[in-house]
Interface confidence: low
């Protein structure tokens, strides 16, 4: 069958019919519906929402919609024994206590089951001691403290500001430094944009607002008790002592009003430079401990949260493909929220809902996509990407054989300035071509394409006239599909102006103030940015599922491989003497990249010329494109990170949110000058170059003529 036989709408109008059916008013209505009560993972409210979405997706016209449940480790505060931090005097009396909850936003005063701010998976404990301020608790911050300032965090409680890196990396760094507790806080320098009012009068974080979040270091494992396998009815579960990624010291988040009270008394060393100062009116002294008059006072944490195996529910909808039903294009985003989820995740879930409705409308008119589209509403993303990872573990054999692409659909907005896309290089051309066909929603760009406004506002640092597209990192549900399984993946959302707004994420992220009103009043009153994101995400899914030849361009992979090889080589060349001493050569990697470039070029030529009416040849060429991403997977995984198996990309070892290129080589080179055994360290660099060169060469060969 040709793709024309899959539909009764002419191919030229398929995409237009799909896009025209998407409506901003529907997205607004769905967002309102999804945000009226909390939908915390593992709660009855989130189960009810799963059933509602299942029912509505069926009404929209999907072929089947099933719930997939798993029993995973989650974490909750103790309802009768709240978490807090205190300042205690020499007699042990608590002279200051942090707040037990966020003041609820107007209109939500009587809502029950608002989980108070907590750091999910914190162990219980009541450590007390002197405070050390560690800036963002990044690797380089601890280097500055320990190596330059000679400050020892061992046995201390550290206080770190949120931002720059994933909170789990902060906690891991604090643990490695010997800290016995971690306090996380939101500094106005990072979560308060000048000239904007705090919620409910604007989109800034009020002093009582607090960011929730998990503090795991799972490295792609999914459920901490069942790494590598689904947490199903007959699962074998590890003991809690063997669980993957759990923190070993108590952790708790606070707002900047409470942080002010802790930081204003700090003594000890002055901050090393201005980059350690936030915007509170405190000295930002590093410590340890309080100054003069307050030197006998200590900080005490009171953490009583519990880890519990709890049932979670994914919703999986299927729209069967007419021509290649065994090829899957997946659109997935999570449903669980910390509280109301006004942005995270429901601004994304509302967009997915409207995309499903539009596809369903076309299907009711007799159309089907060429390939099967799977829609997913993931659970427990906030607790470590658990729903998506467990489902992918359960279905890994099908996915690795049939998975064409995964498009992620968490928050649709984190600002209203311009588009932001992170994706595999295979999708660059798809994204460029699609955005050239879509209208820009931006003021001042009326009648212009999305591509034009995006390129103007967020230009590529390398290629003039093109927009910036970033590497995939992690911290969202694409992780298992891309980093573990090697399925081509991408994500898109509207973002802020990173030039002028240096705060991390958006100010109200993971707070009680992330409401429907936040979006409707301040971010996107007309829901035009949501609609644009729906068009981008939906348009990508449409093209991936419906184009006769997969819209992947392997030549773009060749370009970035050369760029990444140049970058890692220049990092290594900071140590020219050691490279000479230990005979470190990148020749094999550059040679493999050259081969990949040549083979990709020839493949692209063949792709233009082959007989598309021959279903066997068409399927063969498409399979080569589909399996190219898979070819970058090393079955052995990265060192100490077995579930990060992509050789070209992995989440940074220092920041889960960020993507790192040639991560094996990068980590082997990181801080190599401080290694005790240089010969062993440089031997590992050489091994990683070998693995990378082999993988690139092997991937290139999958694009060669098959016989």
């Amino acid at each position: 069958k040709s793709s024309n036989e899959a539909t009764n709408i002419t191919p030229k109008h398929n995409m237009k019919a799909f896009l025209d059916e998407l409506k901003a008013e529907n997205i607004k209505k769905f967002l309102y519906n999804f945000t009226q009560i909390p939908h915390l993972a593992g709660t009855e409210q989130n189960f009810q929402l799963a059933k509602q979405i299942q029912s509505q997706w069926k009404e929209f016209g999907l072929d089947s919609v099933e719930l997939a449940h798993y029993d995973v480790l989650l974490s909750y505060p103790n309802k009768t024994h709240p978490n807090y931090i205190s300042i205690i005097n020499e007699d042990g009396n608590e002279i200051f206590n942090t707040s037990l909850f966020e003041p609820p936003p107007p209109g939500y005063e009587n809502v029950s089951d608002i989980v108070p701010p907590f750091s999910a998976f914190s162990p219980q404990g009541m450590p007390e001691g002197d405070l050390v301020y560690v800036n963002y608790a990044r690797t380089e911050d601890f280097f500055k403290l320990e190596r330059d300032m000679k400050i020892n965090c061992s046995g201390k409680i550290v206080i770190a500001r949120y931002g720059k890196v994933f909170r789990g990396n902060k906690v891991k760094n604090a643990q490695l430094a010997g800290a016995k507790g971690v306090i996380l806080y939101s500094d106005p320098a990072d979560y308060f944009a000048p000239g904007v009012k705090s919620y409910p009068d604007g989109w800034n974080l009020p002093g009582g607002g607090v960011q929730r979040g998990n503090i795991l270091n799972l490295n792609g494992a999914g459920d901490p008790l069942t790494p590598g396998y689904p947490a199903n009815e007959y699962a074998y579960r590890r003991g809690i002592a063997e669980a993957v990624g759990l923190p070993s010291i108590p952790v708790h988040p606070i707002g900047y009003y409470d942080a002010q009270k802790l930081l204003e008394k700090m003594g000890g060393s002055a901050p090393p430079d201005s980059s350690w100062r936030g915007s509170l009116k405190v000295p930002y002294n590093v410590g340890p401990g309080f100054t003069g008059n307050f030197s006998t006072q200590k900080v005490k944490m009171h953490i009583h949260s519990t880890n519990e195996v709890t049932r979670i529910y994914n919703v999986i909808g299927t729209l069967r493909g007419a021509v290649e039903p065994d090829r899957y294009v997946i659109l997935g985003g999570h449903r669980d929220s910390w509280v109301f989820g006004g942005i995270d995740p429901q601004s994304g879930a509302a967009v997915v809902h409207e995309i499903v409705r539009s596809f369903g409308t076309l299907k009711k008119e007799g159309w089907r996509p060429r390939r099967t589209i799977l829609f997913a509403s993931w659970d427990a993303e906030e607790f470590g990407l658990l729903g998506s990872t467990e489902w992918a573990e359960e279905n890994s054999r099908l996915l690795q054989e049939r998975g064409v692409a995964y498009i992620n659909a968490d928050s649709s907005i984190e600002g209203n300035y311009t588009l932001r896309v992170d994706c595999t290089p295979l999708m660059y051309s798809l994204v460029h071509n699609l955005t050239k066909e879509l209208k820009s929603p931006d003021e001042g760009f009326e009648g212009k394409s999305l591509y034009e406004s995006w390129t103007k506002k967020s230009p590529s640092p390398e290629f003039s006239g093109m927009p910036r597209i970033s590497k995939l990192g992690s911290g969202n549900d694409f992780e298992v599909f891309f980093q573990r399984l090697g399925i081509a993946s991408g994500r898109a959302r509207y973002t802020k102006n990173w030039e002028t707004n240096k705060f991390s994420g958006y100010p109200l992220y993971h707070s009680v103030y992330e409401t429907y009103e936040l979006v409707e009043k301040f971010y996107d009153p007309m829901f035009k940015y949501h609609l644009t994101v729906a068009q981008v995400r939906g348009g990508m899914v449409f093209e991936l599922a419906n184009s006769i030849v997969l819209p992947f361009d392997c030549r773009d992979y060749a370009v970035v491989l050369r760029k990444y090889a140049d970058k890692i080589y220049s990092i290594s060349m900071k140590h020219p003497q050691e490279m000479k001493t230990y005979s470190v050569s990148f020749d094999s990697l550059f040679s493999a990249v050259k081969n990949f470039t040549e083979i990709a070029s020839k493949f692209s030529e063949r792709l233009q010329d082959f007989d598309k009416s021959n279903p066997i040849v068409l399927r063969m060429m498409n399979d080569q494109l589909m399996f190219l991403e898979r070819a970058f997977i090393d079955p052995l995984g990265l060192p100490d990170r077995p579930f990060y198996r992509h050789v070209i990309y992995a989440p940074s070892s220092h920041n889960k949110y960020a993507g790192e290129s040639f991560p094996g080589i990068y980590d082997a080179l990181f801080d190599i000058e401080s290694k005790v055994d240089p010969s062993k360290a440089w031997g590992e660099v050489k091994r990683q170059i070998y693995v990378a060169a082999f993988t690139v060469q092997a991937a290139a060969e999958t694009l060669s003529e098959v016989a």
Epitope: P188, S274, R277, S279, K281
Partner: antibody
């Protein structure tokens, strides 16, 4: 419109007292920190005192501590500066100013609305 | 106390010129800095806050930059109404100190 109207200046002998008033209109007075700033003849600006929205926190420049008292009456939308034990060096134009909390609830940010100023002369 | 040192104390310029005024804090104040314009016999007027953010209604020829200890106010394409005295002000900690002022005069 948003404005601050001052009254209460004048000539006073050293050691004497004076009370300055500042009437606010056109904005929610009780939502803002307020401030007094002075300017000696031919000199630059000098901050004098700040008061929190509810009057619970007050800050003063060292040279006036113990002599000047900043206060407010939110019901009357009014700010006051009680000046006792006045000295010749207190001679200046005194301005009341609204503290614009462009950053969260802060005790000393930009002064976005100013009164017209009132002259205080301390001389024998 | 944070001491604010403003320079130059006066500058002569012509209409259309670009004028740069600097302000140095004796210790780091992050971006807690504002700039004011004052004309004779009038109250000061807020131009810039948070070191670089233009107050509503202020012409875009005024711009501010800097962070930590060193800050700059720039006036591009100087206009007749811009001849005045300019003050910087730190609000990072009490006491809230102003710089000594810079008088922009007609050349």
């Amino acid at each position: 419109q948003v404005q601050l109207v001052q009254s209460g200046g004048g000539l006073v002998q050293p050691g004497g007292s004076l009370r300055l008033s500042c009437a606010a209109s056109g904005f929610t007075f009780s939502s803002y920190w307020m401030s007094w700033v002075r300017q000696a003849p031919g000199k630059g600006l000098e901050w004098v005192a700040n008061i929190k929205q509810d009057g619970s926190e007050k800050y003063y420049v060292d040279s006036v501590k113990g002599r000047f008292t900043i206060s407010r009456d939110n019901a009357k939308n009014s700010l006051y500066l009680q000046m006792n034990s006045l000295r010749a060096e207190d001679t200046a134009v005194y301005y009341c100013a609204r503290v614009w909390d462009y950053y969260y609830d802060s005790s000393g940010d930009a002064f976005d609305i100013w009164g017209q100023g009132t002259m205080v002369t301390v001389s024998s | 106390d944070v001491v604010m040192t403003q320079s130059p104390s006066s500058v002569s310029a012509s209409v259309g010129d670009r004028v740069t005024i600097t302000c140095r804090a004796s210790q780091g104040i992050s971006s807690w800095l504002a700039w004011y314009q004052q004309k004779p016999g009038k109250a000061p007027k807020l131009l810039i806050y948070a070191a670089s953010t233009l107050q509503s209604g202020v012409p875009s020829r005024f711009s501010g930059s800097g962070s930590g200890t060193d800050f700059t106010l720039t006036i591009n394409n100087l206009q007749p109404e811009d001849f005045a005295t300019y003050y910087c002000q730190q609000t990072a900690s009490f006491p809230i100190n102003f710089g000594g002022g810079t008088k922009v005069e007609i050349k």
